[in-house]
């Protein structure tokens, strides 16, 4: 089975860890695919290791474990993420995560704390 946090949130400009946990007494993981909606983020294979899709190579870092660290988040990154575990002999298992990217606290609080009285 696949166990994951179904809903997570992170701040714009920040980073988030996308993690699925696969548990089985008999099946072994041979490959894990990560997608943002329909778009490939990265693939891990026991034979070949990690490959991050070139579209995301500057923002996606493999790990920890079989998860991904997604950096420099934008509001457009809000949406569904899917992990697909290919296992032998168990077949294919899928997990879903919904990521909500929120405005950074600085934006929400305004810039008042950075304003100073004019000198003189």
């Amino acid at each position: 089975t696949i166990d994951t946090k179904r809903n997570i949130s992170a701040e714009e400009g920040g980073s988030v860890i996308l993690q699925c946990h696969f548990s089985s007494d008999t099946a072994e993981v041979t490959q894990v695919d990560w997608k943002q909606q329909d778009q490939l983020l990265a693939i891990y294979s026991v034979d070949l290791g990690w490959h991050v899709a070139s579209v995301f190579s500057d923002r996606v870092v493999p790990g920890p474990s079989l998860g991904l660290t997604f950096q420099s988040l934008t509001m457009n990154d809000t949406g569904e993420y899917f992990c697909t575990y290919h296992t032998y002999p168990g077949g294919i298992y899928k997990g879903r995560i919904f990521l909500k990217v929120q405005e950074s606290s600085d934006d929400r609080n305004g810039l008042a704390q950075f304003q100073t009285a004019p000198l003189g």
Epitope: L40, S45, L48
Partner: antibody, heavy 118, light 107 residues
Framework: EVQLLESGGGLVQPGGSLRLSCAAS????????MHWVRQAPGKGLEWVAS????????YYADSVKGRFTISRDNSKNTLYLQMNSLRAEDTAVYYC???????????WGQGTLVTVSS | DIQMTQSPSSLSASVGDRVTITCRAS??????LNWYQQKPGKAPKLLIY???SLQSGVPSRFSGSGSGTDFTLTISSLQPEDFATYYC?????????FGGGTKVEIK
């Protein structure tokens, strides 16, 4: 540098047999799925067969099923295609190809021409 | 089997033109779509994998988009070395299938 070098093509009569080889170098051959793709003269690309990295699974196009056999020898870094009961419509350039993650073909051989004619 | 339909089958264009080639799958294939370039007498070469990822070493004037059933390959500014035949290919399920090809010729 990744290299895939096909050999074994040639002229054969209908009903005859040929065995194609593909010698791989420059990468860990045993880690990759490998495929055969063919191209008839002046035509498009047609997938023929594939084999998983550990040789556990093989797949074939309907047009060659029961006549062609894909195999590999990971100790020799070599991919094979045994072609039996050849037909005129099997005439084509045959390419061996490397397929990481069973997703895309990132390297192709230069191809070997198989001509089936009487 | 999944059918891949490419259009147009051929086109004439000039150096510097923006060229768009489309590929339609007979059923949803998510982003399991790859694009290849082939020149006469040569093996195909991977341009775009997973619908939108640029293969290492391929010029950035090539780009891919789409998901599900409809996909596009775009050459933003056609160069002399880009005159070739382009194929899409789905890897969603066996048998793997290719589009019929689009030949890009000099106008």
């Amino acid at each position: 540098e990744v290299q895939l070098l096909e050999s074994g093509g040639g002229l054969v009569q209908p009903g005859g047999s040929l065995r194609l080889s593909c010698a791989a170098s420059g990468f860990t051959f045993s880690s990759y799925s490998m495929h055969w793709v063919r191209q008839a003269p002046g035509k498009g690309l047609e997938w023929v067969a594939s084999i998983k990295s550990d040789t556990s699974s093989t797949y074939y196009a309907d047009s060659v099923k029961g006549r062609f056999t894909i195999s590999r020898d990971n100790s020799k870094n070599t991919l094979y295609l045994q072609m039996n009961s050849l037909r005129a419509e099997d005439t084509a350039v045959y390419y061996c190809a490397r397929v990481p993650y069973d997703y895309w073909i990132d390297y192709w051989g230069q191809g070997t021409l198989v001509t089936v004619s009487s | 089997d999944i059918q891949m339909t490419q259009s147009p089958s051929s086109l004439s264009a000039s150096v510097g033109d923006r060229v768009t080639i489309t590929c339609r799958a007979s059923q949803s294939i998510s982003s399991y779509l790859n694009w290849y370039q082939q020149k006469p007498g040569k093996a195909p070469k991977l341009l775009i994998y997973a619908a939108s990822s640029l293969q290492s070493g391929v010029p950035s004037r090539f780009s891919g988009s789409g998901s599900g059933t409809d996909f596009t390959l775009t050459i933003s500014s056609l160069q002399p070395e880009d005159f070739a035949t382009y194929y899409c290919q789905q890897s969603y399920s066996t048998p793997l299938t290719f589009g019929g090809g689009t030949k890009v010729e000099i106008k």
